[in-house]
Amino acid sequence: AGGPGSRARAAGARGCRLRSQLVPVRALGLGHRSDELVRFRFCSGSCRRARSPHDLSLASLLGAGALRPPPGSRPVSQPCCRPTRYEAVSFMDVNSTWRTVDRLSATACGCLG
Amino acid sequence: AGGPGSRARAAGARGCRLRSQLVPVRALGLGHRSDELVRFRFCSGSCRRARSPHDLSLASLLGAGALRPPPGSRPVSQPCCRPTRYEAVSFMDVNSTWRTVDRLSATACGCLG
């Protein structure tokens, strides 16, 4: 049960992937007044498997405290789990006007950078 | 001193850019025994200016506590400041052997994803 195969699968389950949640339109920060819910898809998870030699050394330097990054902007030592495709999201506002916002929700993810 | 120009410059200083530091080879995690220092260049800084509509809504949802990301993998609400080009780094190990590690140091950065 604890062999390499099972460990790799467990790590993969935490990897970069598309996730989905119903969210209130008003929390999207679009400035539209609406009490509706919409489905918002986003990307999250690890991209450790896609690390370059630079990333491995950067992680080692950060871990050893040998690098002094500027305050508030710690460098990223793996590619980022980010959307590679998007879709529009539609909803009804409080005036019963149908609104569509382009490229609001992710439809695919990748380890970018 | 507090006009728009200075604000823009200050923001620029926090933006994604190439940074450089002398670091001990032994802290690079390469497995090479060496007491040398090398120049390691890396990328850090904000990519807020490159945010998409998706990113703005994702940031709003996270700020409002309306999104439940999985534990330990908070989604990234802006492109990542990451290397776009790399260079080799060379150094002498304790046996006076010249070592070269490809693609170890960054030479250019960009807001990716």
């Epitope: 119903l22 609406s34 009490d35 509706e36 819910l37 919409v38 | -």
Partner: antibody, heavy 122, light 107 residues
């Protein structure tokens, strides 16, 4: 808290009628489609029908087994949907769920009510 | 109507096992396929949206894949709370249809 609450389930004789209600709270559903799904005891899930939103002129569609007998309606001002069931048959006995389907390129049964029991028996 | 066929209809497994449930559509449905978990006496709960998107709050051990007519739901390491009934459902065409369900039981 976002929730749907069904009511109106009862014991009714074959050939009788019953009207189920589904009230939404914690959000408004005027932009969403409202569906009804049922489940007979120990059986799988069966789609009953749906009513679309105002943009789609409140269009309704029904499953073959209930078409012509059941009618779905909605009152967006009350955030409530209804299922009018006429000419009930013994095989209509089931737990009835109302479900919200939010707009999307691909749709899913997003928010489910707790279900209300309809028993058709003589 | 589009027929959805799930297999197996039931399976016995142990905690920690990797489990795969398949769902086949009678015609191509692209990725208009959702997976639900149902606990006794409760309404179903959406697990996987659009064939492979993990619904928020659902543990990462669940994953979905497939497109067209063949789809799978995988649980990478079964936990005690996963011994329930699972349904696939297509939203490609009206009437929306479900698979007959797969009951995951303790071995």
């Amino acid at each position: 808290e976002v929730q749907l609450v069904e009511s109106g389930g009862d014991l009714v004789q074959p050939g009788g009628s019953l009207k189920l209600s589904c009230a939404a709270s914690g959000f408004t559903f005027s932009g969403s489609a409202m569906h009804w799904v049922r489940q007979a005891s120990g059986k799988g899930l069966e789609w009953v029908g749906r009513i679309r939103n105002k943009v789609h002129r409140y269009a309704t569609e029904y499953g073959a087994s209930v078409k012509g007998r059941f009618t779905i309606s909605r009152d967006d001002s009350k955030n409530t949907a209804y299922l009018q069931m006429n000419s009930l048959k013994i095989e209509d006995t089931a737990v009835y769920y109302c479900v919200v389907v939010v707009p999307g390129s691909i749709e899913a049964f997003d928010i489910w009510g707790q279900g209300t029991m309809v028993t058709v028996s003589s | 109507d589009i027929q959805m066929t799930q297999s197996p209809s039931s399976l016995s497994a142990s905690v920690g096992d990797r489990v795969t449930i398949t769902c086949r559509a009678s015609q191509s449905i692209s990725t208009y396929l959702n997976w639900y978990q149902q606990k006794p006496g409760k309404a179903p709960n959406l697990l996987i949206y659009a064939a492979s998107t993990l619904e928020s709050g659902v543990p990462s051990r669940f994953s979905g894949s497939g497109s067209g007519t063949d789809f799978t739901l995988t649980i990478s390491s079964l936990q005690p709370e996963d011994f329930e009934i699972y349904y696939c459902q297509q939203s490609y065409n009206i009437p929306w249809t479900f698979g007959q369900g797969t009951k995951v039981e303790i071995k």
